[in-house]
Structure formats: C-alpha cells, structure tokens
C-alpha cells in the first residue's frame, strides 16, 4: 500500500509525499514523477513556482538538489530562510517535487485522479489530493529493485517529524533569498500540524529575484520538519476543463 499526498500545481510544480513521511530515494523520485507524466523540476522551474506562491515545509528532490521552497520565513521551515533553500548534504530519503509541462502557468488545484504512466503491478496506490479526496489504483511505478525491496526499510514511526530524527548528518545549506515580506495571518492551513507555522507572512511583490545571488549557511536537517506540505486550501475537480489536468 502506497499513499501519495500531492499538492496544487504552481507553474506545473507540485510536491509529493509518500506514506506520510520522508521515504523517497532519488531514483524513486524520478520514477514517481515519470508515473505522474512529469519530471523532476529544474531549479529554474522551482524558482518560477516559488515566485507565484508555491511553498512547503518539506525537503524534496528536484533535479540535482534537495530543497524546500519558502516564501514566508518560519523558524521550523528551512531555518527561517526564504527562497529555494538547498540542503547540501542529502544522504537520506526525502519527499519529491515534480513538474508537469501540461499544467497551467500559475496555480492549478484540480484533482489528480490517477498515475497515468504507472505500469502493471500488485501495489495499491492511493493518490490523496489536498482536500482529502482519494483515488485508488493497482500498479507499480518503481524500477529500481532497491526501492521496491529496500535493504534497510524506513521505520514507520520515523520521519513524520524532523528529518534529523533519522539522520545524524549535519550539513550545509545554500539558499536563494528574495525580497521583503509583510506579515498577515494565514486563514487555513490544513496540511500544517505545528501551530507555530500557522502565521506566515504574505508577499505583495509581483516577481522575485535573488537578492545578491546565493547565500550559504550551515545547520542541521531539522529545519524542514512539519508533517505535511503545502500551506492551506483545498481542491476538487469541478466544471469544464480549460487546460489539460495533470495527469493527462
């Protein structure tokens, strides 16, 4: 049984969490995105998504990096930093981000109902949309035997909190910072369980550009610990299709 929690798409980028914990390897991340008719996002694609409102509090794979996109500073998400926050010592399992080129250019919260590129298999795969709607199918998407039959399985009660609970690695981070934020209360954050993450700020800038390029700091992996992903909202399928929903 595999549960895949997914978010709205922002400029085609979305977050996928497997079984409610950090449990995806880099090879599985690529396979999972492929199953969603998607690819691992590039840094440029992630930065575009960030610039139109995409943020999470979870480490996830993109092409070449493990990142958390942050708009609003929060002490428990990416060490209070904003921008695309890069974890430089990525030696463990994380969530993943995916990019679907067929998604609309800004926010798309229509429900994803299946894994179009999954192949035949015995696994019950449940896609859980942000509003809790669930779509179940049998199949498989993993191609790496180590992902299907891991030699050291992830313990079920680990990594729903901070990733430092299962990794003693203390590594550096690189993050891209963006312009100033102005606090207002967020009204609904069903994905976020830690109450300290319920009062993010909001941006009123139209676009964001790295201020002074990249900045480097150091810390532990414990920054992205909130169980859940995108902050706020709900989604269901409704009405006539304007652009292709993902997956196609």
């Amino acid at each position: 049984q595999i549960d895949l929690n997914i978010t709205c798409r922002f400029a085609g980028v979305f977050h996928v969490e497997k079984n409610g914990r950090y449990s995806i390897s880099r090879t599985e991340a690529a396979d999972l995105c492929k199953a969603f008719n998607s690819t691992l996002p590039t840094m440029a694609q992630m930065e575009k998504a960030l610039s139109i409102g995409f943020e999470t509090c979870r480490y996830g794979f993109i092409e070449g990096h493990v990142v958390i996109p942050r708009i609003h500073p929060n002490s428990i998400c990416a060490a209070n930093n904003t921008g695309v926050y890069i974890l430089t010592s990525n030696t463990s399992q994380y969530d993943t981000y995916c990019f679907n080129a067929s998604a609309p250019p800004e926010e798309d919260c229509t429900s994803v109902t299946d894994l179009p590129n999954a192949f035949d298999g015995p696994i019950t795969i449940t896609i859980v949309n942000r509003d809790g709607t669930r779509y179940v199918q049998k199949g498989e998407y993993r191609t790496n035997p180590e992902d299907i039959y891991p030699s050291n399985p992830t313990d079920d009660d680990v990594s729903s909190g901070s990733s430092s609970e299962r990794s003693s690695t203390s590594g550096g981070y690189i993050f891209y910072t963006f312009s100033t934020v102005h606090p207002i209360p967020d009204e609904d954050s069903p994905w976020i369980t830690d109450s300290t993450d319920r009062i993010p700020a909001t941006r009123d800038q139209d676009t964001f550009h790295p201020s002074g390029g990249s900045h480097t700091t150091h810390g532990s992996e414990s920054d992205g610990h909130s169980h859940g992903s995108q902050e706020g909202g709900a989604n269901t399928t409704s009405g006539p299709i304007r652009t292709p929903q993902i997956p196609e």
Epitope: G12, P105, D108, E187, T202, G233, A234, R242, T243
Partner: antibody, heavy 117, light 112 residues
C-alpha cells in the same frame, strides 16, 4: 450556477476606507486563485490584486500597493478587498474574478466605488 | 508586465458584414502545454465584461458560433462572421499567462 456577487461599494471621502466583499457560489471556491479587476468610468480594465487558493500569497498592482489588502475566507466562500487611503483615482467599478486554473475565468457584476469629497 | 495592444480602437460595422479585431502581446502567450493564454471579452454598455473566447480559440459556453478566435504566440485575431446589432460594445483582449493580467485598450464596435 457559477456566480460571483460583489458588495460593499459606495461613496467615500478621499483618505477614507471601504471593504468590498465577493460571495462565490456554484464552484469550489477554495480551488481557485481569485482576483480583483477595476474599471474607472469610461476607461479600460485594470487588474488590481490576486490571492492564491490558500490565502497565503498575494499580489498587487503598483497603483494600490500598501493601501489595498486582498484576503479570503474559504469557509465562507468569500473574497475581500480592504481599501484604505482612498484617492479620487480609485473611483471605479470593482469586479471580482475567478482565476482561470483549468477553467475559464468568471467575473462578477461589479461594485461601484466613488471617492469624492 | 506583458503589454497588450489592440487595433483598431474604433470599428464601425454594418449588420450582416464580417468584422475583425487584432490583438498583439509584447511576449509570447504560448505556454509549454501548447495553449495560448489569451482571452477575448465583450463589454456591452452598462454591463460587466463577458467572456467570449478563452485559450485563444475556445468559445465560452453560450457564445454564438459567429465569434471565433485565432492566432498564436504574440498575434491574435477575433472575428465576427456576420455582425448583429447585439454585438455592439467594447471588445477587450486579455493575457492570462501570468499575473498581473493585462488588457488591450479596447475596441469599440458600433453600427454604422
């Protein structure tokens, strides 16, 4: 039926405040980025502000930045525009509009805001 | 921001005759998903704008088939195959590729 209904417009003095509301029905409000667009008398259309589905990310036109605040209450299916420090040039019909996402944009009928002494 | 330019700004028409309005954007509105994020609206006197065409060429629900949209990238056209009296008003093109939404100046269509 998909519907957006604006309210809260009226006559206000320069420097004053007003809050517009937009009640949504007939669709899943919490799925959509929402927008405010305005039209000054005899003029064209001007986008004012937008807010993503969660309410956690907003954008504003330069002409209203720092004076207007967009917000939403997904539990009430309602969009708001708080307008402070109003100026004569803010006089317009204000439309709330559903973002396009995977479906065509939907507009309300508009609410007239007149800023005059 | 993406700039939108419409022409002509005024279009006197004869009922039963065709009419055409042009819209040009300062950057391509063709998204990687293959759709052009260009909408056409008609604002009749005293009314709110009503959607005619979305994604460049898709007629909105309830819009008569005499209206058609075409074009790709930066150049778009709205055509009315046979103008009727009820088609008078101001026509706007709008780009929906990115926020801020931006609009053409409007084309006023009136009966000769």
């Amino acid at each position: 039926e998909v519907q957006l209904l604006e309210s809260g417009g009226g006559l206000v003095q320069p420097g004053g405040s007003l809050r517009l509301s937009c009640a949504a029905s007939g669709f899943t409000f919490s799925n959509y980025t929402m927008n405010w667009v305005r039209q000054a008398p005899g003029k064209g259309l001007e986008w004012v502000s937008s807010i993503v589905s969660s309410g956690g990310f907003t954008k504003y036109a330069d002409s209203v930045k720092g004076r207007f605040t967009i917000s939403r209450d997904n539990s009430k299916n309602t969009l708001y525009l708080q307008m402070n420090s109003l100026r004569a040039e803010d006089t317009a019909v204000y439309y709330c509009a559903r973002g396009w996402s995977s479906q065509p944009a939907i507009w309300g009928q508009g609410s007239l805001v007149t800023v005059s002494s | 921001d993406i700039q939108m330019t419409q022409s002509p700004l005024s279009l006197p028409v004869t009922p039963g005759e065709p009419a055409s309005i042009s819209c040009r954007s300062s950057q391509s509105l063709l998204h990687s998903n293959g759709y052009n994020y260009l909408d056409w609206y008609l604002q009749k006197p005293g009314q709110s704008p009503q959607l005619l065409i979305y994604l460049g060429s898709n007629r909105a629900s309830g819009v008569p088939d005499r209206f058609s949209g075409s074009g790709s990238g930066t150049d778009f056209t709205l055509k009315i195959s046979r103008v009727e009296a009820e088609d008078v008003g101001v026509y706007y093109c709008m780009q929906a590729l990115q926020t801020p939404w931006t609009f053409g100046q409007g084309t006023k269509v009136e009966i000769k």
